[in-house]
């Protein structure tokens, strides 16, 4: 005996208690191959989930995460909360950054701020918990007397405040 | 390949208890941490346990302290959640995870590889 079951196409099934025949997915189901006996359950996008692409009889729902979360697995399986900038996600929640260390991101760990001195260079701008340091030139290079590409300001008149 | 792969999901009543089991592949389980985390319907991921290589530091979350044991066989490649006095806010499906390192904490969020969860439902 040939299976009929073979010639059903995605989106239906095939119906033994109709003597093969190819039925249509019932409403929130699918197949997205053909010659299936069942139709699969479409996923529900709810709670920290929304719809991203929404079901149909021949393909699952897809889901992403609502504001303030963001996805991690395989097709957003899961939902990771966001933390703001300055933070970082510990097993207890969203914590700030410890001093000497920042995060840019809404994700991620706090990192420790750039070691200007180790490339010889002095700290042009101090670091946050949401931004890294700023090296500038090296320490002899802001000595008085050294040589520089740019020529000095001009010396300002007392009591005269910049433009 | 890295693999994670949990069991002992159900349906259980308020107040029963249920035991889930992860077992490990691909990698040497007795150099990492472990944890577990879990996901209710309308929630966030939720950190729950966690337990060093060695399986000499445990750290809970303070929603299961007393209820929850966590613990490993590191000769069967396994880690396990004892899951006691269950109440309807456990409903969750719970994912075994692999940390970064063989040490923990409770503060860290170290995690590198997910397994795929199994479902628990509290209710009567």
């Known amino acids: 005996l040939q299976d009929l079951c073979s010639n059903c196409p995605a989106g239906t099934f095939c119906d033994n208690n109709r003597s093969q025949i190819c039925s249509p997915c019932p409403p929130n189901s699918f197949s997205s191959a053909g010659g299936q006996r069942t139709c699969d359950i479409c996923r529900q996008c709810k709670g920290v989930f929304k719809t991203r692409k929404e079901c149909s009889s021949t393909s699952n729902a897809e889901c992403d995460c609502i504001s303030g979360y963001h996805c991690l697995g395989a097709e957003c399986s899961m939902c990771e909360q966001d933390c703001k900038q300055g933070q970082e996600l510990t097993k207890k929640g969203c914590k700030d950054c410890c001093f000497g260390t920042f995060n840019d991101q809404k994700r991620g760990i706090c990192r420790p701020w750039t070691n200007c001195s180790l490339d010889g260079k002095s700290v042009l701008v101090n670091g946050t918990k949401e931004r890294d340091v700023v090296c500038g030139p090296s320490p002899a290079d802001l000595s008085p007397g050294a040589s520089s590409a740019t020529p000095p300001a001009p010396a300002r008149e007392p009591g005269h405040s910049p433009q | 390949e890295v693999q994670l792969l949990e069991s002992g999901g159900g349906l259980v009543q308020p107040g029963g208890s249920l035991r889930l089991s992860c077992t490990a592949s691909?990698?040497?389980?007795?150099?990492?941490?472990m944890s577990w985390v879990r996901q209710a319907p309308e929630k966030g991921l939720e950190w729950v346990s966690s337990i060093s290589g060695s399986g000499g530091s445990t750290f809970y979350a303070d929603s299961v302290k007393g209820r929850f044991t966590i613990s490993r066989d590191n000769s069967k490649n396994t880690l396990y959640l004892q899951m006691n006095r269950l109440t309807a806010e456990d409903t969750a499906v719970y994912y075994c995870?692999?940390?970064?390192?063989?040490?923990?904490?409770?503060?860290?969020?170290?995690?590198?590889?997910w397994g795929q969860g199994t479902t628990v439902t509290v209710s009567s």
């Open positions: 691909g990698f040497t389980f007795s150099n990492y941490a």
């Open positions: 995870a692999k940390e970064g390192s063989n040490g923990t904490d409770d503060y860290h969020y170290d995690i590198d590889v």
